[in-house]
């Protein structure tokens, strides 16, 4: 029978008695930076080339005995998970191993840096097909390790890393915190976050997605035919490296941004029990479990978007938080969220020739998050149209006035500390969906984009009585690009996108009372690209 | 690999050289910063990654490393260049006393310095 982890990542159409998806990643080379490995193990023999790279610290303690099987344990298992004959994800992928972890599973930032440099030099000397680098290790936050990962990613390499086994915010660890790296948390057979001893998988906004990482059967270095169960975010990362190899083998031209968006898109959504995570991390942690795409081709027509949360701004009065998209992505909308509800909104602004999403804290606030909606939109030309606070009591309005530009997101930001208290809601005039509406004291920002075949529509869901959460989702075939709350509801904590659903959060109902001000309206902007759909049909 | 297994090699005491003239002052208004792991048990003091500014060439990296050795020698400190980085990030890995950090941060082309730290299998 199929091991639970392989079944979990396999779409139903591939599920047979044996895990045998088409094309096993044969065009892709996966680099593994880990312990030494047992390359003659039946699972990986002929699939893994051991490079001569070794940079490891001495083992701790005078009583440590180097046992070959222990030294090779972690790396052998992971190589098996990526490409093993029986229990591997991408059975056709070839691998190269670099030893950066000693027999105790310990390495150094500097050794890892030299390893990454070795990969870059190898890539320059002998360019091959797509490269995936698996980093099944973690240390404390490291500026230099993150910088090296960024450089390698910008050279076209896909880096996949373990979120860490510290039951902590992954942003406190490297390379997990590097934005360019695909960071993977671990779930178990029940789709629950993995507990390991007293700790468990890391979580938070620096995690891109989760994957199977508990009780994973793979090659054991105890003997050339042995298997063993291992657990951890390394095992989870190895699954994603295998899935990435499969995707890149099917579409070798995929960029890192495209690959990440596809990994997110094809993941199982909302299956993880979030109660395991600390309360303040639940909204920041993606509820996604990795899976292979149902077919190797034909995903290109879709408009892919993902949600990127900023770091917390901190509580000072003028504190701001910034969320950024990857270089190949377009920022299509910007929203903000504050647990205390005290915020001064958000705005899209240019920074280094690229749009970013900036959220503003308010006096007495505990801090804010900026939430960027980052999308893949080829040949896009996007700009922000701003309307300063209006004089009229009707509120502030802004629309996309350029020919062929469509509205993809609305943001509003204000200078007054407590906008909206004792003010009636401002309603959107019907029949004018291509505009953003806000308080008269607020600046309103419309994200307007022109791209071949791009069409968008506004969808609203209003609830007259106060409720902690109001949602509105885009229907099949449409992608959520913008998420905001209609103004006038003073108790709104903020808005953010979760997959294809716009979520507007309000203060605890018990504290707000059920006045007319309790009305909450979630506004979603849903888009699709006819151009991408046509291009995909022409290919097929 | 360059000097990776230098367990038995002596740390080179760099003698005063013409390299050790007046150090080029770092660009006006930019100060190199020092970083270290927030988790104390994972710190590896005594080994530092000196990261140079983005467009620094390999020859400049080597020259900066030699300058550090020379200036350290003048102060009676042993240093050892374990690796010179190029290809991903310009810079070098150096084994030295933490007392020399202030000196190293003032070297030309230096962007920041990070103390080495441990990473672990997950």
């Amino acid at each position: 029978s199929i091991p639970w982890n392989l079944e979990r990542i396999t779409p139903p159409r591939y599920r047979a008695d044996e895990y045998q998806p088409p094309d096993g990643g044969s065009l892709v080379e996966v680099y593994l930076l880990d312990t030494s490995i047992q390359s003659d193990h039946r699972e990986i023999e002929g699939r893994v080339m051991v490079t001569d790279f070794e940079n490891v610290p001495e083992e701790d303690g005078t009583r440590f005995h180097r046992q070959a099987s222990k030294c090779d344990s972690h790396g052998t298992h992971l190589a098996g998970v990526v490409s093993g004959r029986d229990a591997g994800v991408a059975k056709g992928a070839s691998m190269r191993s670099l030893r950066v972890l000693n027999c105790q599973g310990k390495g150094t930032v500097s050794g890892t840096l030299i390893g990454l440099e070795f990969i870059r030099k190898s890539q320059l000397v002998q360019p091959v097909g797509p490269l995936v680098v698996l980093l099944p290790l973690a240390g404390g936050y490291s500026r230099v390790l993150n910088a090296a990962c960024q450089r390698l990613a910008r050279a076209g390499v896909v880096l996949v890393t373990a979120a860490g086994n510290f039951r902590d915010d992954a942003c406190l660890y490297s390379p997990a915190s590097a934005p360019e790296v695909i960071t993977v948390g671990a779930t178990n057979a029940q789709d629950q976050p993995v507990t390991l001893g007293t700790l468990g998988t890391n979580f938070g906004r620096c995690v891109d997605l989760f994957a199977p990482g508990e009780d994973i059967i793979g090659a054991s270095s105890d003997c050339s035919t042995c298997f063993v169960s291992q657990s951890g975010t390394s095992q989870a990362a190895a699954h994603v490296a295998g899935i990435a190899a499969m995707m890149l083998s099917a579409e070798p031209e995929l960029t890192l941004a495209e690959l990440r968006q596809r990994l997110i898109h094809f993941s199982a959504k909302d299956v993880i029990n979030e109660a395991w995570f600390p309360e303040d991390q639940r909204v920041l942690t993606p509820n996604l479990v990795a899976a292979l795409p149902p077919s190797t081709h034909g995903a290109g027509w879709q408009l892919f978007c993902r949600t990127v949360w900023s770091a917390h701004s901190g509580p000072t009065r003028m504190a701001t938080a910034v969320a950024r998209c990857a270089p190949d992505e377009e920022l299509l909308s910007c929203s903000s969220f504050s647990r205390s509800g005290k915020r001064r909104g958000e705005r899209m602004e240019a920074q280094g020739g690229k749009l970013v999403c900036r959220a503003h804290n308010a006096f007495g606030g505990e801090g804010v998050y900026a939430i960027a909606r980052c999308c893949l939109l080829p040949q896009a030309n996007c700009s922000v149209h701003t309307a300063p606070p209006a004089e009229a009591s009707m509120g502030t309005r802004v629309h996309c006035h350029q020919q062929g530009h469509v509205l993809t997101g609305c943001s509003s930001h204000w200078e007054v500390e407590d906008l909206g208290t004792h003010k009636p809601p401002v309603l959107r005039p019907r029949g004018q969906p291509n505009q953003c509406v806000g308080h008269r004291e607020a600046s309103i920002h419309a994200s307007c984009c022109h791209a071949p075949g791009l069409e968008c529509k506004v969808k609203e869901h209003g609830i007259p009585a106060p409720q902690e959460q109001v949602t509105v989702a885009c229907e099949e075939g449409w992608t959520l690009t913008g998420c905001s709350a209609l103004p006038g509801t003073s108790h709104v904590l903020g808005a953010y996108a979760v997959d294809n659903t716009c979520v507007v959060r309000s203060r605890d109902v018990s504290t707000t009372g059920s006045t007319s001000e309790g009305a909450v309206t979630a506004v979603a902007i849903c888009c699709r690209s006819r151009h991408l759909a046509q291009a995909s049909q022409e290919l097929q | 690999q360059e000097d990776e297994d230098g367990d038995y090699e002596e740390l080179v005491l760099a003698l005063r050289s013409e390299e050790d003239g007046l150090a080029e002052a770092p660009e006006h208004g930019t100060t190199a910063t020092f970083h270290r792991c927030a988790k104390d048990p994972w710190r590896l003091p005594g080994t530092y990654v000196v990261v140079l500014k983005e467009e620094t060439h390999l020859s400049q990296s080597e020259r900066t490393a030699r300058r550090l050795q020379a200036q350290a020698a003048r102060r009676g400190y042993l240093t050892k260049i374990l690796h010179v980085f190029h290809g991903l990030l310009p810079g070098f890995l150096v084994k030295m006393s933490g007392d020399l950090l202030e000196l190293a941060l003032k070297l030309p082309h230096v962007d920041y310095i990070e103390e080495d730290s441990s990473v672990f299998a997950q």
Epitope: S1, P3, K70, S73, H74, D86, A87, Q104, G105, K106, N165, F166, T195, L196, G197, L199, E214, D215, I216, I217, S220, D222, C223, T225, C226, F227, V228, S229, Q230, S231, G232, S234 | P41, W42, S118, F120, A121, Q122
Partner: antibody, heavy 130, light 107 residues
Framework: EVQLVESGGGLVQPGGSLRLSCAAS????????MSWVRQAPGKGLEWVAN????????YYVDSVKGRFTISRDIAKNSLYLQMNSLRAEDTAVYYC???????????????????????WGQGTTVTVSS | DIQMTQSPSTLSASVGDRVTITCRAS??????LAWYQQKPGKAPKLLIY???SLESGVPSRFSGSGSGTEFTLTISSLQPDDFATYYC?????????FGQGTKLEIK
């Protein structure tokens, strides 16, 4: 689905020997530690012995040390218990069980996380009597 | 060797009752404790591992708690299928010991 089937039980005289076998179906047999557990008539459970995946480590309850030997054959997906110098108090139903556990790493190194005996055989009866 | 002591030895209860079985270890075993259910003539079945983690497929009315030397198994609302003998088991350095068992019978 992993299944365990014990065999080899029977009636034996005190001082005699018996070899119990446990046949496993399912790929995961070789991936876990395995145990033998016994239950004397009308009594509770008693753990007897266990063995690592590759057979390199074995542990026994004090009362059987030097008399019983646990072994496994990965190629045959089988677990064995060789019982020598049998005594009346060894009379029991003998179960083989899979010790579900997993290895993981943290900053302290390699660790073992134990879940428990999650798959059991139906048992085989051993009677030691003259 | 670590001894495990279960109490009570026998427990009479009715369907719908909330019942608690206690297990004490002779020395600290951290959270390395499992609970099993056994019905006459059948092999034991794993219910709880690591003191409080519910094994897959086990009804949520079963729960475990405790650490160190004191552990409890609780059945929140007894069902007819729950009348059986329950055993605790400690894991310590690859060798195990079971408690003597608690027989849960219909009142």
């Amino acid at each position: 689905e992993v299944q365990l089937v014990e065999s080899g039980g029977g009636l034996v005289q005190p001082g005699g020997s018996l070899r119990l076998s446990c046949a496993a179906s399912g790929i995961t047999f070789s991936s876990y530690w395995m145990s033998w557990v016994r239950q004397a008539p009308g009594k509770g459970l008693e753990w007897v012995a266990n063995i690592k995946q590759d057979g390199s480590e074995k542990y026994y309850v004090d009362s059987v040390k030097g008399r019983f030997t646990i072994s496994r054959d990965i190629a045959k997906n089988s677990l064995y218990l060789q019982m020598n110098s049998l005594r009346a108090e060894d009379t029991a139903v003998y179960y083989c069980a899979r010790d579900r556990g997993t290895y993981y790493y943290d900053s302290g190194g390699y660790n073992y996380y134990y879940y428990g005996m999650d798959v059991w055989g139906q048992g085989t009866t051993v009677t030691v009597s003259s | 060797d670590i001894q495990m002591t279960q109490s009570p030895s026998t427990l009479s209860a009715s369907v719908g009752d909330r019942v608690t079985i206690t297990c004490r270890a002779s020395q600290s075993i951290s959270s390395w404790l499992a609970w099993y259910q056994q019905k006459p003539g059948k092999a034991p079945k794993l219910l709880i591992y690591k003191a409080s983690s519910l094994e897959s497929g086990v009804p949520s009315r079963f729960s475990g708690s405790g650490s160190g030397t004191e552990f409890t198994l609780t059945i929140s609302s007894l069902q007819p299928d729950d009348f059986a003998t329950y055993y605790c088991q400690q894991y310590n350095s690859y060798s195990y010991t079971f408690g003597q068992g608690t027989k849960l019978e219909i009142k």
